[in-house]
């Protein structure tokens, strides 16, 4: 089974201050849920509501959880308050730079006059309602999902080519007397809470994660 | 110091072409992604045009077709050519930097004058 | 296309004065947003970058909120060198700007 992807691109650090005290949040209304047999979730898919029968425990198992990957109550910021740095330095997303994340030794955050190879744009996806899963398929996303009378979204954090054709042009620094480039956004995949018949069910999604240079080499012209 | 400078503004008559320029200092062109904003007489700020660090460009609608934005790194300028100018088009001219990473524009030129009139 | 809609688009207040301008984007830009201070003749002056990031050498007094669709400029204590117009900026997209990329503006002049 494949990993959840944790790690997020230069410069786009995932507020996980606020991702922790929203997960607190849903892990509130997932222990009342318990205490009522067969916890009733109900589902809004395509401006529908249906009621269908979710064990909270499908919300227990962390292991495959992805920080890209969010149930709130309300928007997620983009980044985040001071009070918020008791959790985890500098989590904002994504560019706060008065702080330092856990993550930047091997993601440092941007500051004033440094360069990415590609431009790059991180937001929270909160209206996301159909993606492509692991084996190829379609699938149907759960927008939001009623744990014990809270309506919680279904956000994930995506990051993409800022420009929407980089074929047409090369990755910034890049040496183009030698080298062809260009820039292109790659996919993770993420556990999401997706319907299956007509039941919610764990399914790994493709999200965008981040702008990538992908070069090749120039051919050698022989005289 | 980092400095835009823009130049080539002026009075043209309807249907007219003028290129303005904008000439860079302390930075080279070529790394950065550049644009044009123009402001009509006691109007608001107008995004005109954009030309990425790999030489992609992008229009406002009211510039596509009719304007067009290049650089020459040699020069270290930026350009703006400006074909089928209209009354409308009458507005002061601004180059600047778009900031990396947080696409802002934290370097601004002083701004050159099109009129555009008969 | 994303739309920058800036309100209101004149504010009279006095010096002294907490003074608040709101920026709403169509749909969601992240914290891709920029706020700048304009003079008559002038070219624009970055204040504010990232949403709520101080650029450097701007007083303490202004400072920047919101992120996703919904962000506010504050001026603190209004000072008489603060009268100018105010532009908020989306940063997020580049193409398909045919609803420009800034804000219609709001001018704050003297009570």
């Known amino acids: 089974e494949p990993h959840s992807e944790s790690n997020v691109p230069a410069g786009h650090t995932i507020p996980q201050a606020h991702w922790t005290k929203l997960q607190h949040s849903l892990d509130t209304a997932l222990r009342r849920a318990r205490s009522a047999p067969a916890a009733a979730i109900a589902a809004r898919v395509a401006g529908q509501t249906r009621n269908i029968t979710v064990d909270p425990r499908l919300f227990k198992k962390r292991r495959l959880r992805s920080p890209r990957v969010l149930f709130s109550t309300q928007p997620p910021r983009e980044a985040a308050d001071t009070q918020d740095l008791d959790f985890e330095v500098g989590g904002a997303a994504p560019f706060n730079r008065t702080h330092r994340s856990k993550r930047s030794s091997s993601h440092p955050i941007f500051h004033r006059g440094e360069f990415s190879v590609c431009d790059s744009v991180s937001v929270w996806v909160g209206d996301k309602t159909t993606a492509t899963d692991i084996k190829g398929k379609e699938v149907m996303v759960l927008g939001e999902v009623n744990i014990n009378n809270s309506v919680f979204k279904q956000y994930f954090f995506e990051t993409k080519c800022r420009d929407p054709n980089p074929v047409d042009s090369g990755c910034r620094g890049i040496d183009s007397k030698h080298w062809n480039s260009y820039c292109t956004t790659t996919h993770t995949f993420v556990k999401a809470l997706t319907m299956d018949g007509k039941q919610a069910a764990w399914r790994f999604i493709r999200i965008d994660t981040a702008c990538v240079c992908v070069l090749s080499r120039k051919a050698v012209r022989r005289a | 110091e980092v400095q835009l400078v823009e130049s080539g503004g002026g009075l043209v008559q309807p249907g007219g072409s003028l290129r303005l320029s904008c000439a860079a200092s302390?930075?080279?062109?070529?790394?950065?992604?550049l644009v044009w904003v123009r402001q009509a007489p006691g109007k608001g700020l107008e995004w005109v045009g954009f030309i990425s660090y790999g030489d992609t460009t992008y229009y406002a609608s009211s510039a596509k077709g009719r304007f067009t934005i290049s650089r020459d790194n040699s020069k270290n300028t930026l350009y703006l050519q400006m074909n089928s100018l209209r009354a409308e088009d009458t507005a002061v001219y601004y180059c600047?930097?778009?900031?990396?990473?947080?696409?802002?524009?934290?370097?601004w030129g002083q701004g050159t004058l099109v009129t555009v009139s008969s | 296309d994303i739309q920058m809609t800036q309100s209101p688009s004149t504010l009279s207040a006095s010096v002294g004065d907490r003074v608040t301008i709101t920026c709403q984007a169509s749909q969601t830009i992240s914290n891709y947003l920029a706020w700048y201070q304009q003079k008559p003749g002038k070219a624009p002056k970055l204040l504010i970058y990232g949403a709520s990031n101080l650029e450097s050498g701007v007083p303490s007094r202004f400072s920047g909120s919101g992120s996703g669709t919904e962000f506010t400029l504050t001026i603190s204590s209004l000072q008489p060198d603060d009268f100018a117009t105010y532009y908020c900026q989306q940063g997020y997209t580049i193409s398909n700007v045919d609803n420009n990329v800034f804000g219609g503006g709001t001018k704050v002049e003297i009570k």
């Open positions: 600047a930097r778009e900031t990396a990473n947080t696409y802002d524009y934290g370097i």
């Open positions: 302390g930075f080279t062109v070529s790394g950065y992604n």
